[in-house]
């Protein structure tokens, strides 16, 4: 099966790599602009230079292109705890991340929020905190895991999801009646 190509990809595939077809004259292949620049004017003819201009401050292009405008630099989302790892340059977008001992939770493909890694108080670290994953804790006896924090079984009411985890403690408090769990 031949993958479906958009108009732009069809036009580009006619020219050798690193060149694109002139939008007004399909017999001319113009050289693409280097990363960090954008297309100001198409080449006037075969073998003649494309007019490329450097991106202005606050914009970038990360690969060779024939874009009429540079892309706007991303801004790190401070309200989501993001910090700037590296600033935007003409050929690279801003890189955002989280502080030390934090992990990323992605709300969508490109939008993440920074959360503090769990310390596993009243438990032990089963898996260390990673860039996109919180610490995995194993709780000590008498504690249950709630949103990756170890919480005392004294906070566990019957019929809640902690019941099975705190079953011995609940039986001690409530007596030895059969709770219907195994």
């Amino acid at each position: 099966l031949v993958p479906h190509l958009g108009d732009r990809e069809k036009r580009d595939s006619v020219c050798p790599q690193g060149k694109y077809i002139h939008p007004q004259n399909n017999s001319i292949c113009c050289t693409k602009c280097h990363k960090g620049t954008y297309l100001y004017n198409d080449c006037p003819g075969p073998g003649q230079d494309t007019d490329c201009r450097e991106c202005e401050s606050g914009s970038f292009t990360a690969s060779e292109n024939h874009l009429r405008h540079c892309l706007s630099c991303s801004k790190c989302r401070k309200e989501m705890g993001q910090v700037e790892i590296s600033s935007c340059t003409v050929d690279r977008d801003t890189v955002c991340g989280c502080r030390k001992n934090q992990y990323r939770h992605y709300w969508s493909e490109n939008l993440f929020q920074c959360f503090n890694c769990s310390l596993c108080l009243n438990g032990t670290v089963h898996l260390s905190c990673q860039e996109k994953q919180n610490t995995v804790c194993t709780c000590h006896a008498g504690f249950f895991l709630r949103e990756n924090e170890c919480v005392s079984c004294s906070n566990c009411k019957k019929s809640l999801e902690c019941t099975k985890l705190c079953l011995p403690q609940i039986e001690n408090v409530k007596g030895t009646e059969d709770s219907g769990t195994t």
């Epitope: 949103e147 809640l160 902690c162």
Partner: nanobody, 120 residues
Framework: EVQLLESGGGFVQPGGSLRLSCAAS????????MSWVRQAPGKGLEWVSA????????YYADSVKGRFTISRDNSKNTLYLQMNSLRAEDASVYYC?????????????RGQGTLVTVSS
């Protein structure tokens, strides 16, 4: 068993308002972050907003910021989404979702959705 039941959707003209509700059961509601996501016909799930267990922290997608407000009533196990200044592009099926923090985007536990239609 986790159950989430959305309501409040309907037909509204551009510029109008709607308030969505989500009744939660089968888990300790106040312990968990909750989220609203939406899906327009033929498109993927889009995150809209999220709120912490206590309700103290709220977050919004750029596309709805300043127009939508997420809130919760933990005594009623209910999540809300107040939608103002609705636009044609807001038309979608809206789902509430129980959030599992870390990694993502993950909206494994979500309801059956409520349809919002915005048209003149």
């Amino acid at each position: 068993e986790v159950q989430l039941l959305e309501s409040g959707g309907g037909f509204v003209q551009p510029g109008g308002s709607l308030r969505l509700s989500c009744a939660a059961s089968g888990f300790t509601f106040e312990w968990y972050w909750m989220s609203w996501v939406r899906q327009a016909p033929g498109k993927g799930l889009e995150w809209v907003s999220a709120i912490s267990g206590s309700g103290g922290s709220t977050y919004y997608a750029d596309s709805v910021k300043g127009r939508f407000t997420i809130s919760r009533d933990n005594s009623k196990n209910t999540l809300y989404l107040q939608m103002n200044s609705l636009r044609a592009e807001d038309a979608s099926v809206y789902y509430c979702a129980k959030v599992k923090l870390g990694g993502g985007p993950n909206f494994g536990y979500r309801g059956q959705g409520t349809l919002v239609t915005v048209s003149s």
